[in-house]
Interface confidence: medium
């Protein structure tokens, strides 16, 4: 969707111009989650909405199967919110008992599945201790970068446990990206 | 301000170009809040700087009466940072006598109002529970995602309790917009 | 890099139209900190990766000496993660013994220096207080905002305790910009 | 603690080159700005232009920017003046300060007469 | 250029006087700056920003102003305040002074 400019031989033009409103961009809004199997020290990929409420998709990027589909190469800023909510951790008992303990934690992973790389690349991360005392608990991890993402890269959200993840409001969690 | 590409017959254009320096944008910085009579089972809106130090509103984005109004439709990526601060909170006094208890907690929204739809949009939503043992406490929530606005769209913050945002630094606690 | 659009008269343009892919751009990764000097009651900058894995600088934005430099005037987005991890704060135990405390905190500051002004400008901070109970605990601080910069401007990270910054991963701690 | 001490020859010939050198000390320059700034007997300041010596980046005074050539050695903590086809209006003090982030400081400046 | 139209250009006062210097822009800045140079001496900067006092300056000293009017201003004139005082701003290209104001003690 990039024209070169062919222009009079006055003008300068430096690189292909394109309309801002023909850029790749896309954002879900969190769906209830279905239990799946995931492998063993993998973390679960969440699954969501690309069309109701806020969500959408447009511009040739597509969202399939967990997965927003990057469709042209370039430099996208990519985001995303989870939150999490959880009853009183275990760790917080044993920390009642005064027994120092390996925090529990939350963990949001935005990973990059190229199909010519063997190994999924981690983005980014928001990681957190969790060791609430004697009540139900919630919080949010945001993130948010720039990367230079080359065309038919997938992109997904990772989480640690997926119970923990708060799926009631389309608000509260949500994945996007948008070509720059 | 979008001007139709007219352009010789072998220069493909896809759709209006516009310069990146003409785009609508603001980044408002927190002031001392005055108490306002908020409506029952409604969040109050934050008031906002949008002209000294590192606010400013530019190209027909403009703010007024704690919104800021989107001059132009597209996709915008609209982003807030509020920062809380406390004392202990009563929950925590609770659990110290071992009862379980609903945690008090902070809130932010960011929240679209379409003179055309009667209710409120709540576009994004971080929100924590605090159970802070013996101390004063503070920590920010961040909130920035992508939204397709309309001229005419209105964008205001919410927050759970005004009385605990801290309002002493312009770097602490803002609200932006800008458009793709 | 801005070329003025000469076309026919028929055709409106309303300012320098330039390619998307060839505005400044960063994103700066964790590296393994030098204990440095720092100046009493300023926190340290922390340094980064500028070429390796998922780190980049073009268009002429430059990183040099723990600063981004900011090649061209104009608006940009900035951001940076810092994920910090710890043993149990001294503050929590005095908690435990009852005995409330100003709680230990974590902080991170965007901080430009401009050489027509004696002071740095803070243009985000994300500060919290930390009190954690018998255990070691981590967690990430987000910030990113739009700022109007200066060709010559420079941006930089501080943090409150550059011992607590988690180094080990490229997607826990990064810092970035781009030109909107 | 922070200096900043100019060099070079007090005295230099109508149409050569002014050469002078800042040499600092008790600071990172790559976290800073240096200028060139002179004064005119019996006048006033004049801002002859800068450089950030992280990436060597220079403005210069438009007035003198055809004339006016600022460099800095990073690896000997110094930067330099070079001003060329001098006149007796070119007859200044001469000094070398550090601003951008930090207070700014002047060097006690370095007196160039042009004469023959 | 940014033209910096300082007034008076020369003042005479006595100890404990209220001093006012005026800087005129001919064109709006964000940020004046105020620097004190006595004979032989480098300049020193006392006011940034406009109104904020450099680090070590006495509280006497002040700045005010924005756009294109500046005011500097010694509260109580001091045997030690003889100088020349020079306004400045930063933000155009070329970076330009005004032309001094020379203050003496009566």
């Known amino acids: 969707l990039k024209g070169q400019e062919f222009a009079p031989s006055h003008q300068q033009v430096y690189a292909p111009l394109r309309a801002d409103g023909d850029k790749p961009r896309a954002h879900l809004t969190v769906v209830r989650q279905t239990p799946t199997q995931h492998l063993k020290n993998q973390f679960p990929a969440l699954h969501w909405e690309h069309e109701l409420g806020l969500a959408f998709t447009k511009n040739r990027m597509n969202y399939t199967n967990k997965f927003l589909l990057i469709p042209e190469s370039g430099d996208y800023f990519v985001y995303s919110q989870v939150t999490f909510r959880g009853m009183t951790s275990e760790c917080s008992e044993i920390r009642q008992a005064g027994r120092p303990n390996k925090p529990d934690s939350i963990t949001v992973v935005i990973t990059k599945v190229t199909d010519s790389y063997p190994e999924p690349t981690q983005l980014l991360m928001g990681t957190k201790s969790v060791c609430e005392v004697g009540s139900n608990w919630f919080q949010p991890i945001y993130l948010g970068a720039m990367f230079s993402l080359q065309e038919g890269d997938k992109l997904m959200v990772n989480v640690s446990d997926i119970s923990l993840v708060d799926y009631t409001k389309e608000d509260k969690t949500f994945f996007g990206a948008f070509l720059l | 301000l979008k001007g139709q590409e007219f352009a010789p017959s072998h220069q493909q254009v896809y759709a209006p170009l516009r310069a990146d320096g003409d785009k609508p944008r603001a980044h408002l910085t927190v002031v001392r809040q005055t108490p306002t009579q908020h409506l029952k089972n409604q969040f109050p809106a934050l008031h906002w700087e949008h002209e000294l130090g590192l606010a400013f509103t530019k190209n027909r984005m403009n703010y007024t009466n704690k919104f800021l109004l989107i001059p132009e439709s597209g996709d915008y990526f609209v982003y807030s940072q509020v920062t809380f601060r406390g004392m202990t909170s009563e929950c925590s006094e609770i659990r110290q006598a071992g009862r379980p208890n609903k945690p008090d907690s902070i809130t932010v929204v960011i929240t679209k109002v379409t003179d055309s739809y009667p209710e409120p949009t709540q576009l994004l939503m971080g929100t924590k529970s605090v159970c802070e043992v013996g101390s004063n406490w503070f920590q920010p929530i961040y909130l920035g995602a992508m939204f397709s606005l309309q001229e005419g769209d209105k964008l205001m913050v919410n927050v759970s309790d005004i009385s605990l945002v801290d309002y002493t630094k312009e770097d602490k606690t803002f609200f932006g917009a800008f458009l793709l | 890099l801005k070329g003025q659009e000469f076309a026919p008269s028929h055709q409106q343009v309303y300012a320098p139209l330039r390619a998307d892919g060839d505005k400044p751009r960063a994103h700066l990764t964790v590296v393994r900190q030098t204990p440095t000097q720092h100046l009493k009651n300023q926190f340290p900058a922390l340094h980064w990766e500028h070429e390796l894995g998922l780190a980049f600088t073009k268009n002429r934005m430059n990183y040099t000496n723990k600063f981004l430099l900011i090649p061209e005037s104009g608006d940009y987005f900035v951001y940076s993660q810092v994920t910090f991890r710890g043993m149990t704060s001294e503050c929590s135990e005095i908690r435990q013994a009852g005995r409330p405390n100003k709680p230990d905190s974590i902080t991170v500051v965007i901080t430009k220096v401009t050489d027509s002004y004696p002071e740095p400008t803070q243009l985000l901070m994300g500060t919290k207080s930390v009190c954690e109970v018998g255990s070691n605990w981590f967690q990430p601080i987000y910030l990113g905002a739009m700022f109007s910069l200066q060709e010559g401007d420079k941006l930089m990270v501080n943090v409150s305790d550059i011992s607590l910054v988690d180094y080990t991963k490229e997607d826990k701690t990064f810092f970035g910009a781009f030109l909107l | 603690q922070v200096q900043l001490q100019e060099s070079g020859p007090g005295l230099v010939r109508p149409s050569q080159t002014l050469s002078l050198t800042c040499t600092v000390s008790?600071?990172?320059?790559?976290?800073?700005?240096m200028h060139w700034v002179r004064q005119r007997p019996g006048r006033g300041l004049e801002w002859m232009g800068r450089?950030?010596?992280?990436?060597?980046?220079?403005k210069y005074n438009p007035s003198l920017k055809s004339r006016v050539t600022i460099t800095r050695d990073t690896s000997k903590n110094q930067v330099s003046l070079r001003l060329s086809s001098v006149t007796a209006a070119d007859t200044a003090v001469y000094y070398c300060?550090?601003?951008?982030?930090?207070?700014?400081?002047w060097g006690q400046g370095s007196l160039v007469t042009v004469s023959s | 250029d940014i033209q910096m139209t300082q007034s008076p250009s020369s003042l005479s006062a006595s100890v404990g006087d209220r001093v006012t210097i005026t800087c005129r822009a001919s064109?709006?800045?964000?940020?004046m700056y105020w620097y004190q140079q006595k004979p032989g001496k480098a300049p020193k900067l006392l006011i940034y920003?406009?109104?904020n006092l450099a680090s070590g300056v006495p509280s006497r000293f002040s700045g005010s102003g924005s756009g294109t009017d500046f005011t500097f201003t010694i509260s109580s004139l001091q045997p030690e305040d003889i100088a020349t005082y020079y306004c400045?701003?930063?933000?155009?290209?070329?970076?330009?002074f005004g032309q001094g104001t020379k203050v003496e003690i009566k």
């Open positions: 300060v550090r601003s951008g982030g930090l207070p700014d400081v």
């Open positions: 008790g600071f990172d320059m790559g976290d800073t700005y």
């Open positions: 450089i950030e010596p992280a990436a060597g980046h220079t």
């Open positions: 064109q709006g800045v964000e940020y």
């Open positions: 920003g406009a109104s």
């Open positions: 400045q701003q930063w933000e155009g290209n070329p970076r330009t």
